[in-house]
């Protein structure tokens, strides 16, 4: 069956670059000050190709001595970006990714931004703020999410194959109606996973099968009318 027989079911996506942030506005800073400092580490899923802004603890910049961002990415030496208020100087060590920058001048805004998040940005990000009252830090386990490419086709009579290619994390595939299914996962070196579900329907009154792919980036469904059983000419329903 040719590819043009596939019916894609998904909401139209907005391809403008989205931006995500866990930063809080000034009102929240005073309300949640102690709570935020207690929540030192945050797991944060971020969709690939979006912009991300990571925040330091909500400490007034006037109380600051040094801000340091420590960035630990897989397979790379630890990168640090530091700002010393007294001398108004910034220093970088082992930082090669030009997409990871201060949001603006660090004396005005201590936040870190990642422009156009890539799989390579998976890792741990920590802001350490040195003040006269002690050191405060906030860490992020950044999990980059990759939307899988979804395809559906028939490879044999009354057998359909649904693939969620190169998703991160692995997608989950379900079917309507349920069939006799086998699912395989293929892991790629970049951290993405391809999930392949092959199903067979023996019941002859099944006309159309729907593959539903669930993923943290959103859900997609595809459907296809099954080919007839070879040799079957007529049936009453």
């Amino acid at each position: 069956q040719p590819n043009n027989s596939l019916m894609l079911q998904t909401s139209k996506e907005n391809h403008a670059l989205a931006s995500s942030s866990l930063c809080m506005d000034e009102k929240q800073i005073t309300q949640n000050y102690s709570k935020v400092l207690a929540e030192v580490n945050t797991s944060w899923p971020v969709k690939m190709a979006t912009n991300a802004v990571l925040c330091c603890p909500p400490i007034a910049l006037r109380n600051l001595i040094i801000i340091t961002w420590e960035i630990i990415l897989r397979g790379q030496p630890s990168c640090t970006k530091a700002y010393k208020k007294e001398t108004n100087e910034t220093k970088e060590t082992n930082c090669t990714d030009e997409r990871i920058t201060w949001v603006s001048r660090p004396d005005q805004n201590s936040d870190l931004q990642i422009r156009t998040v890539a799989i390579t940005h998976d890792g741990y990000y920590r802001c350490i703020m040195v003040t006269p009252d002690g050191n405060f830090h906030r860490g992020y386990h950044l999990q980059v999410l990759v939307t899988p490419e979804v395809t559906l086709f028939q490879n044999r009579n009354r057998t359909a194959v649904c693939k969620a290619v190169a998703g991160k994390p692995a997608a989950h595939i379900s079917w309507i109606p349920e069939g006799d299914c086998a699912t395989k996962q293929e892991y790629w070196s970049n951290g993405t996973v391809t999930v392949k579900s092959t199903c067979h329907w023996e019941v002859h009154n099944v006309s159309t099968v729907t593959c539903h792919v669930s993923h943290l980036t959103g859900n997609k469904s595809l459907y296809i009318e099954l080919l007839p059983v070879p040799g079957a000419k007529k049936s009453a329903k």
Partner: antibody
Framework: QVQLVQSGAEVKKPGASVKVSCKAS????????MHWVRQAPGQGLEWMGN????????NYDEKFQGRVTMTADTSTSTVYMELSSLRSEDTAVYYC???????WGRGTLVTVSS | DIQMTQSPSSLSVSVGDRVTITCQAS??????LHWFQQKPGKAPKLLIS???NLEDGVPSRFSGSGSGTDFTFTISSLQPEDIATYYC?????????FGQGTKLEIK
């Protein structure tokens, strides 16, 4: 863009037969099921059956079993629906549809009247 | 056969109203479906395919949701041109079956 062009309106006597045609273009004719649906005046929609032109495989709804015949001519990309032993309650608009029900013809009015 | 129970069968509406139509598949059997709009003398027009996918050129005030056996079709703010009859169609099992239709009438 898939296009389904149906034959014109028909007036038939009770007991007669009618054959409605539906010519498809814009897609691979032999790769998609073609369905027939009818609608009596002021009534809802009723599925009659389907045919797979690539193999001639057919499914008929039990209600029409023995009275309906669906065929396909792959040389002209045309499907046919023939309904025999017509009665007044077969007066309806008959639609062909394909691409899992997403493309419809404009319909053919069949009037059965003595 | 799968029966599609569509409700309500008719609805008196005003321009600007939010309209909700439901379809439920019998026997607790999960299915997939389309939603159609039909105006007098015209063929049904596909609005929502596969339960929730808005067809190209269809205004965004139309939406579909649901999965399994229970589905909902919504018009967020009714316009005069939306006065029509609406049908659901399950296409998972043969025979394909339609809901009995919901006719919208102006109050």
């Amino acid at each position: 863009q898939v296009q389904l062009v149906q034959s014109g309106a028909e007036v038939k006597k009770p007991g007669a037969s009618v054959k409605v045609s539906c010519k498809a273009s814009g897609h691979t004719f032999t790769s998609y099921w073609m369905h027939w649906v009818r609608q009596a005046p002021g009534q809802g929609l009723e599925w009659m059956g389907n045919i797979y032109p690539g193999s001639g495989s057919i499914n008929y709804d039990e209600k029409f079993q023995g009275r309906v015949t669906m065929t396909a001519d792959t040389s002209t990309s045309t499907v046919y629906m023939e309904l025999s032993s017509l009665r007044s309650e077969d007066t309806a608009v008959y639609y062909c549809l394909t691409m899992t029900g997403t493309s419809w013809g404009r319909g053919t009015l069949v009037t059965v009247s003595s | 056969d799968i029966q599609m129970t569509q409700s309500p069968s008719s609805l008196s509406v005003s321009v600007g109203d939010r309209v909700t139509i439901t379809c439920q598949a019998s026997q607790g059997t999960p299915i997939n479906l389309h939603w159609f709009q039909q105006k007098p003398g015209k063929a049904p027009k596909l609005l929502i395919s596969g339960a929730s996918n808005l067809e190209d050129g269809v205004p965004s005030r139309f939406s579909g949701s649901g999965s399994g056996t229970d589905f909902t079709f919504t018009i967020s703010s009714l316009q005069p041109e939306d006065i029509a009859t609406y049908y659901c169609l399950q296409f998972t099992y043969i025979p394909w079956t339609f809901g009995q239709g919901t006719k919208l009438e102006i109050k």
